[in-house]
C-alpha cells in the first residue's frame, strides 16, 4: 500500500479582479474563394478541389451553377496555356478568405476593434485568424467583468457567394457553411479541425466561458509530462503542440513534405502530394493510428469551459435595415451574417488540482 502513490483531486473557485481573455481562432469552412482561383491555380489544384478530372477537364456535372460553370469553363481552357510555378502555401494565403472582407463589426469590452487585431494563422482549414494571440509584441487583453458587454462581439459575413462549388468529396471542400471557432490559451497553438466548434450563419451565438486551471501530478502520483517541449517548433509543451509536432513528423516520414499549416522546413506538399499522400495519411493518423502520436498531459494547463446558446439573426424586423446598412439583399443577410459573442460568465476561475494523498 505504501508504494501506491495515491492522489486526491482538489476543486476550488478563485475570485479574480481581472482575467486574461483567451485567444479566439476562427476559420471560414470554405478554404478558397472562388473569385481568387486563377487559371494557374485551377491547372495545378483543380483535381485536388474536384473541379477538374485527371485530364484537366471540367467533369460532366449537372450540379453546377450556370454562372460559376461559365467562369470555370473559361479558366479551364488550357489551350496554349503555359503553367507557371505554383505553391500551396501561397495559394492558401492569397485565395483564403480575408478577415478585412469578412469582419463587419468588432467590439472588445465595448471598444471598437478591427481586422488589424486578428493575426493570420494557418490550420488544416487553410487561412484562419486569431484574435488576442498575444504575439508580435501585443499584450494579452484582460477583462474586468463577466457578461456579454465585457468580452468579444464580432459580426461576420461568411461570403457564401465565394464558396467553391462541390462536385466531389475531398478534404479541401466543405459541405457546410459557416465558421469554426476555437477558444484556447495563448500558450498553445490552435488545433481547430479537431477541437473547434461550429458557428452557423443566420444566428447570433453566445459563448459563456469559464477559465479552468488544471494542475496534474507527475509520475508516480499521476501521468503528466513535467519536461519542457522537446521541439524545434513550439516554446511550451501542450497536447496540441505535441500533436501538431507529431503529425508533421508523420507526414514528412510518409510523404516527404508538410501541409501548409505545419511548422518546419520540409517542402510544402504539392497538390498531387496532398491528394495522393498527405490528406489520406493525416486522415489515417487522426482516425486509425492509436499509437504514433501519444501525447502526455502537461502538468499545468488552462482550458475554457463553454456554454453555447443561439438566437436568430436577422429578425423579420431588422432584415431590411441590415440589408440596407450592408448594401446586400435580405436573402444574402440571412445566408451569410453571423454574430459571435464570447465572454466570461463570472470573473473567477476554477482550479482542479491533483495533490499527493500523503507525503
Amino acid at each position: 500500500y505504501y508504494f501506491c502513490y495515491h492522489h486526491v483531486t482538489k476543486l476550488d473557485e478563485v475570485a479574480a479582479s481581472q482575467l486574461t481573455f483567451p485567444a479566439v481562432t476562427l476559420c471560414n469552412l470554405n478554404e478558397f474563394r472562388f473569385s481568387q482561383v486563377s487559371k494557374n491555380d485551377l491547372y495545378h489544384a483543380g483535381e485536388l478541389l474536384a473541379l477538374l478530372n485527371n485530364r484537366y477537364e471540367i467533369p460532366d456535372t449537372q450540379m453546377a451553377d450556370e454562372k460559376q460553370l461559365e467562369i470555370l469553363q473559361d479558366k479551364a481552357n488550357f489551350r496554349s496555356f503555359k503553367p507557371k510555378p505554383f505553391n500551396m502555401r501561397e495559394f492558401y494565403d492569397r485565395a483564403g478568405h480575408d478577415i478585412r472582407d469578412m469582419l463587419l463589426s468588432c467590439h472588445f469590452r465595448g471598444e471598437a476593434c478591427s481586422a488589424e487585431d486578428f493575426k493570420v494563422v494557418f490550420t488544416r482549414y487553410g487561412k484562419c485568424y486569431t484574435f488576442n494571440s498575444g504575439q508580435d509584441g501585443r499584450p494579452r487583453l484582460k477583462t474586468m467583468k463577466g457578461g456579454t458587454g465585457n468580452g468579444l462581439e464580432i459580426m461576420l459575413d461568411i461570403q457564401q457567394d465565394e464558396y467553391l462549388p462541390v462536385w466531389g468529396e475531398t478534404d479541401e471542400t466543405s459541405f457546410e457553411a459557416g465558421i469554426k471557432v476555437q477558444i484556447h490559451s495563448q500558450d498553445e497553438p490552435p488545433f481547430i479541425d479537431q477541437l473547434g466548434f461550429g458557428v452557423a450563419p443566420g444566428f447570433q451565438t453566445f459563448v459563456s466561458c469559464q477559465e479552468q486551471r488544471l494542475i496534474y501530478l507527475p509520475s508516480p502520483w499521476g501521468t503528466c509530462n513535467a519536461v519542457t517541449m522537446d521541439s524545434d517548433f513550439f516554446d511550451s509543451y501542450s497536447i496540441t503542440a505535441c500533436r501538431i509536432d507529431c503529425e508533421t513528423r508523420y507526414l514528412v516520414e510518409n510523404c516527404n513534405c508538410r501541409m501548409v499549416h505545419m511548422p518546419g522546413d520540409a517542402p510544402y506538399c504539392t497538390p498531387e502530394q496532398y491528394k495522393e499522400c498527405a490528406d489520406p495519411a493525416l486522415d489515417f493518423l487522426v482516425e486509425k493510428d492509436q499509437e504514433y502520436c501519444v501525447c502526455e498531459m502537461p502538468c499545468n494547463l488552462t482550458r475554457y469551459g463553454k456554454e453555447l446558446s443561439m438566437v436568430k439573426i436577422p429578425s423579420k424586423a431588422s432584415a431590411k435595415y441590415l440589408a440596407k446598412k450592408f448594401n446586400k439583399s435580405e436573402q444574402y443577410i440571412g445566408e451569410n451574417i453571423l454574430v459571435l459573442d464570447i465572454f466570461f460568465e463570472v470573473l473567477n476561475y476554477e482550479t482542479i488540482e491533483q495533490k499527493k494523498a500523503y507525503e
Epitope: N254, P280, A281, D283, F284, E287, K288, Q290, E291, Y292
Partner: antibody, heavy 116, light 107 residues
Amino acid sequence: EVQLLASGGGLVQTGGSLRLSCAASGFTFSSFAMSWVRQAPGKGLEWVSGISGSGGSTYYADSVKGRFTISRDNSKNTLYLQMNSLRAEDTAAYYCAKEAYKWQPWGQGIRVTVSS
Amino acid sequence: DIQMTQSPSTLSASVGDRVTITCRASQSISSWLAWYQQKPGKAPNLLIYKTSNLESGVPSRFSGSGSGTEFTLTISSLQPDDFATYYCQQYNSYSYTFGQGTKLEIK
C-alpha cells in the same frame, strides 16, 4: 526504397511449428503497425494477424487465435510470426505488409506447406 | 468481424469494355477500402487506396468510388493486361478482411 523481405517458410508436419520473419528497410519500422496476410492455393486473401508499432497490441484472425503469435524486434527492424500446432489448412503463401493509409509494400510471399 | 462481399465472383468481358466490380461491407468502414489486382503466382498489387486514391503507376482507367458500406472499382476501358483477379480489403478495423475475389476473364 521501402522494402519487406520474408523468410522462414518450408515444409512442416501437421502439429509442427515454424517461425516466419519479415525484414524491413527504408522506413522507420517502429512507427508503423504491421500485418501478416496469407493465401491458400487457389483461394482468396486472408488477413492473419497484426501488431502495433511498439508491439504492445496484437490482433489475430479467429482461425489462428491461440496457435499463432505475432511479434516484432524494432531494434532489428524485423517482424515475426510464430506458428504452432500447424494444420493442413494453414498451407498457404504468407505475406507481410506495412499498415498505413495504404498497405504498401507487401513482402514477396513465403510458402508454408503443412503435410500429414 | 466485418464481412466483405464482392460481386460478381466471375466476370467475362472483352477488351475495350467498361467493367464495374462491387464490394459491400457488413457495416460502415468509412472510406478505408483498398482494391488489389493479383495475377497467378504473384503478390497482390495495390490499385486503389482509401476508396478512390489511385496508387502511383496505376493506369488512370482504374477508378474507385463509394463510402460507408458500398464501394465500386471501375475499369473504364479493359486492356489485355487487366485480366486478373481483383480483391477489395477493408482496413477500418481489426480483423481486417478481404472480399472473396472477382476473377475477370476474357469473353
